[in-house]
């Protein structure tokens, strides 16, 4: 019961966190204009990992994709790149772990089968959960590192008579949803695994012994003394431990937008 | 056809207060924000501030704080400034504009000439 | 605040000539969000409400002719009437729509000989 639940609760977490994921790199706000000790301008600023938006103060919101590949910065593409890797990796998991949830059953599917699902399944949510949170950071570093940079030389100008203000940039709200979806993939991964070493427990497997009596003779066989309720063999209980995760290589692509709203 | 349709003239004595009106039509008012703009006469152009009517969120001219106060009324598709404590230096045009792109304003009511005198 | 200031601050021309009014901002008003330039120029003619122009420095509002063209960038901004008609007569305000409080420049009084 309580591995069930485990299980269970290891695939919702998951669920909640890939979703997260989905959400996070799909988000906008990836980076936020920093209003304070800021002049206070009347537009303002955010960006995400597909494209960059403006909302001025009159309510309209502009909103232009990246349409370039070659010209963005080599970081960008590698946040992209670990989003959509999680995210793959995560889809895939979530496919392998439906299969794999004790509450489900498929057609004579051996317990060592949903065994091997479940470890497979949770790998693959730790790996995505990773990749986020990498991704996220990854991002985060870049910001710092930019705003700082930003903060040194903030106001550049002709002779101190004309000044331009820099536009500085902070965490915007896709940063924490990806650390916290990141982290709930990972923690559903966690427990995943833990599920599956329940759902695998230590077999004592015993030769099979004959004793020949006087008068007839019986053959015994005995299972595992955990998985089976009697003498003879019990294969249906029988865990067998064979898999890594496997990954396959998908391209998600995003539709640009140009919108007003 | 866009239009702000704003308030009659109004004269007021010095200390007393005065609330005018711009009414919109011809687009959905909660969707554009609506500007003031002060013009004392054969003067430039000030702003004021703006209400938005869809949240009534409003932002002023810290020049016009405690002087203009900024509402909107969703079912009458009306935008108001009051104006307070009134003296000679507030007598002038004020209008009413509709934000556009650019936060640039491109339709203006006719203007309410506000005259304060005793 | 930001200062607009705008020159020349009258100027008497006959009509078919070309005009240039400029307006210079005490800040950039280029937002590099979406480089754009948050700078507005309206037309006010005696006794009427004022009119748009341009947005976004350059931008050209529908059922404006198009003798009119708006430029610059940063700080520095033009308007310029290629062919001075009649009913141009005005006075042409520029607006830094960018930083709070918005401001307009003291105005271009346009007349005609």
């Known amino acids: 019961m309580a591995v069930t639940a485990c299980q269970g609760l290891g695939f919702v977490v998951s669920l909640i966190g890939i979703a997260g994921i989905i959400a996070a790199t799909c988000m906008d706000q990836w980076s936020t204009q920093d209003l304070y000790n800021n002049p206070v301008t009347a537009v303002f600023n955010y960006q995400g990992l597909w494209r960059s938006c403006v909302r001025e103060s009159s309510g309209f919101t502009e909103c232009r994709g990246y349409f370039t590949l070659l010209g963005l910065p080599a970081m960008l593409q590698a946040v992209r790149a670990l989003m959509i890797v999680g995210i793959v990796l995560g889809a895939i998991g979530l496919l392998v772990s439906i299969f794999a949830l004790k509450c489900i059953r498929i057609g004579s599917m051996e317990d060592s089968a949903k065994a091997n699902m479940t470890l497979t399944s949770g790998i693959m949510f730790i790996v995505s959960g990773l990749c986020a949170i990498a991704g996220v950071s990854v991002f985060a570093n870049m910001l710092v590192t930019n705003f700082w940079m930003s903060t040194a030389n903030m106001y550049t100008g002709m002779g101190g008579m004309v000044q331009t203000v820099q536009t500085r940039y902070t965490f915007g709200a896709a940063l924490f949803v990806g650390w916290v979806a990141g982290g709930l993939t990972l923690i559903g991964g966690v427990m995943m695994c833990i599920a599956c070493r329940g759902l695998a427990p230590e077999e004592t497997n015993y030769k099979a012994v004959s004793y020949h009596a006087s008068g007839h003779s019986v053959a015994y066989k005995p299972g595992g003394f955990k998985a089976s309720t009697g003498f003879g063999s019990n294969t249906k209980n029988k865990k067998i431990y064979d898999g890594g995760a496997r990954t396959e290589d998908e391209v998600q692509s995003y539709p640009s937008k140009h919108d007003y709203v | 056809e866009v239009q702000l349709q704003q308030s009659g003239p109004e004269l007021v004595k010095p200390g007393a207060s005065v609330r005018m009106s711009c009414k919109a039509s011809g687009y959905t008012f909660t969707s554009y924000v609506v500007h003031w703009v002060k013009q004392k006469p054969g003067q430039g152009l000030e702003w004021i501030g703006y209400?938005?009517?869809?949240?009534?969120?409003?932002k002023y001219n810290e020049r016009f704080k405690g002087k203009a106060t900024l509402t909107s009324d969703k079912s009458s598709n009306s935008a108001y400034m009051e104006l307070s404590s009134l003296t000679s230096e507030d007598s002038a045009v004020y209008y009413c504009?509709?934000?556009?792109?650019?936060?640039?304003?491109?339709?203006w009511g006719a203007g309410t000439t506000v005259t304060v005198s005793s | 605040d930001i200062v607009m200031t705008q020159s020349p601050s009258s100027l008497t021309v006959t009509t078919g000539e070309k005009v240039t009014m400029s307006c210079k901002s005490s800040?950039?008003?280029?937002?590099?969000?979406?480089?754009?330039?948050?700078l507005t120029w309206y037309q006010q003619k005696p006794g009427q409400s004022p009119k748009l122009l341009f947005f976004w420095a350059s931008t050209r509002q529908s059922g404006v002719p198009d003798r009119f063209t708006g430029s610059g960038s940063g700080t520095y901004f033009t308007l310029t009437i290629s062919s001075v008609q009649a009913e141009d007569l005005a006075v042409y305000y520029c607006q830094n729509d960018y930083y709070f409080p918005f401001t307009f420049g003291t105005g271009t009084k346009l007349e005609i000989k």
């Open positions: 209400i938005n009517p869809y949240n009534a969120d409003s």
């Open positions: 504009s509709r934000s556009y792109y650019g936060n640039s304003f491109d339709v």
């Open positions: 800040q950039s008003l280029l937002n590099s969000g979406n480089q754009k330039n948050y």
